[in-house]
């Protein structure tokens, strides 16, 4: 019988030779389960693993803890890959992450984290950064120390609020802290003075909804 | 839509005193806090006051106690600045911002910078010499 390839990342994909940015097949190691998710073989050297990405709208973020465990939407599109392949994937080896933005007037922006990864369910998919650098700010616009997820099901964030019900999305909330990529998605010219928009603040400041995000994530040593 | 409209700033004297106002539209001031701001030449925004609750909580920074009053009129949806004993250290834009008044972390009383997401566009505020 011939051995199955399966990939865990979309380094490996890379490095397999094929190199053509799209969505491919990932599957963890010992694990049956696989994920689609968009690989963007270009930006930076490539083998980039695309865990997020807003970009018109199309797609509903207000979703619940079970749906942002298991990922939505549309890898081609609008989608979250989900906390529960990422948690595992980011502790098995080291990864890095890249928050890739867009704003209305035509500007882009990143943040590059040298160190990520996503604690357990147990733990609420809890996010752990280190060491930020990148054009999107000199202050990291996600809370540090990293704090819990939260959706609108789920409530763990250190609001006497409920951040991810206040400000639309699954998100690791502060009370509720300097972004939300995970927003209410504004057209432009209703971008400005927003209360739940895509917010990143070290960047754009305050009320800002940005044009287009993507969150994407890459073995350190590659 | 959500605006913030300030006014009442010009250019005043040394000791003189000056009632700012913003103006709010969009939403209703019983479920938001507002703050104001100002921004001087070259300088970051920094806090002046704040308040929510009706008035039942207001705060204000070390610089301007005893000096500044905040208040608000929730029937015409208006906060106020009143700024006596002006200095010429107080020259700067003053900014009115909003953000929902639950947005608190536990056991703290007040709302970090990035935290107010609608800003008016300022008035400006001159204290001479």
């Known amino acids: 019988k011939e051995e199955q390839i399966s990939f865990r990342d979309c380094a490996e994909v890379f490095k397999s030779g094929h190199t053509t940015n799209g969505v491919y097949t990932l599957t963890l190691p010992n694990s049956t389960e696989e994920v689609k998710a968009y690989c963007d073989m270009e930006a930076g050297g490539g083998g980039w693993t695309i865990i997020q990405r807003r970009e018109d709208g199309s797609v509903d973020f207000q979703r619940t803890w079970k749906e942002y465990k298991v990922g939505f939407g549309n890898p081609s599109g609008e989608y979250w890959l989900g906390n529960e392949f990422v948690s595992q994937l980011t502790n098995q080896q080291r990864y890095v992450l890249k928050i890739h933005l867009k704003d209305w007037e035509g500007n882009e922006a990143y943040s590059l984290y040298e160190h990520f990864y996503l604690s357990s369910e147990e733990l609420n998919y809890r996010i752990h950064l280190k060491g930020l650098t990148g054009t999107a700010g000199k202050i990291s616009s996600i809370s540090q120390p990293g704090n819990d997820f939260s959706t609108k099901d789920a409530d763990n964030d250190k609001c006497i609020c409920k951040c991810s019900q206040m400000l639309t999305g699954g998100w690791w909330f502060d009370a509720c802290g300097p972004s939300n990529l995970n927003g209410m998605y504004y057209p432009q010219r209703q971008n400005t003075n927003k209360f739940n928009g895509i917010k990143w603040y070290y960047w754009k400041g305050s009320g800002y909804s940005l044009k287009g995000t993507t969150m994407m994530i890459r073995p350190a040593d590659f | 839509e959500v605006q913030l409209v300030e006014s009442g700033g010009g250019l005043v004297q040394a000791g003189g005193s000056l009632r700012l106002s913003c103006a709010a539209s969009?939403?209703?001031?019983?479920?938001?806090?507002i703050g104001w701001f100002r921004q001087a030449p070259g300088k970051e925004r920094e806090g002046v006051s704040s308040?929510?609750?009706?008035?039942?909580?207001?705060y204000y920074a070390d610089s301007v106690k005893g000096r500044f009053t905040i208040s608000s009129d929730n029937d015409k949806n208006t906060v106020y600045l009143q700024m006596n004993s002006l200095k010429p250290e107080d020259t700067a834009v003053y900014y009115c911002?909003?953000?929902?008044?639950?947005?608190?972390?536990?056991?703290?009383?007040?709302?970090?910078?990035?935290?107010?997401?609608?800003w008016g566009q300022g008035t400006l505020v001159t204290v001479s010499s």
């Open positions: 308040i929510r609750d009706n008035g039942g909580s207001t």
């Open positions: 911002a909003a953000v929902p008044a639950g947005r608190l972390r536990f056991g703290e009383q007040w709302y970090p910078l990035y935290e107010y997401d609608a």
């Open positions: 969009g939403f209703t001031l019983d479920d938001y806090a």
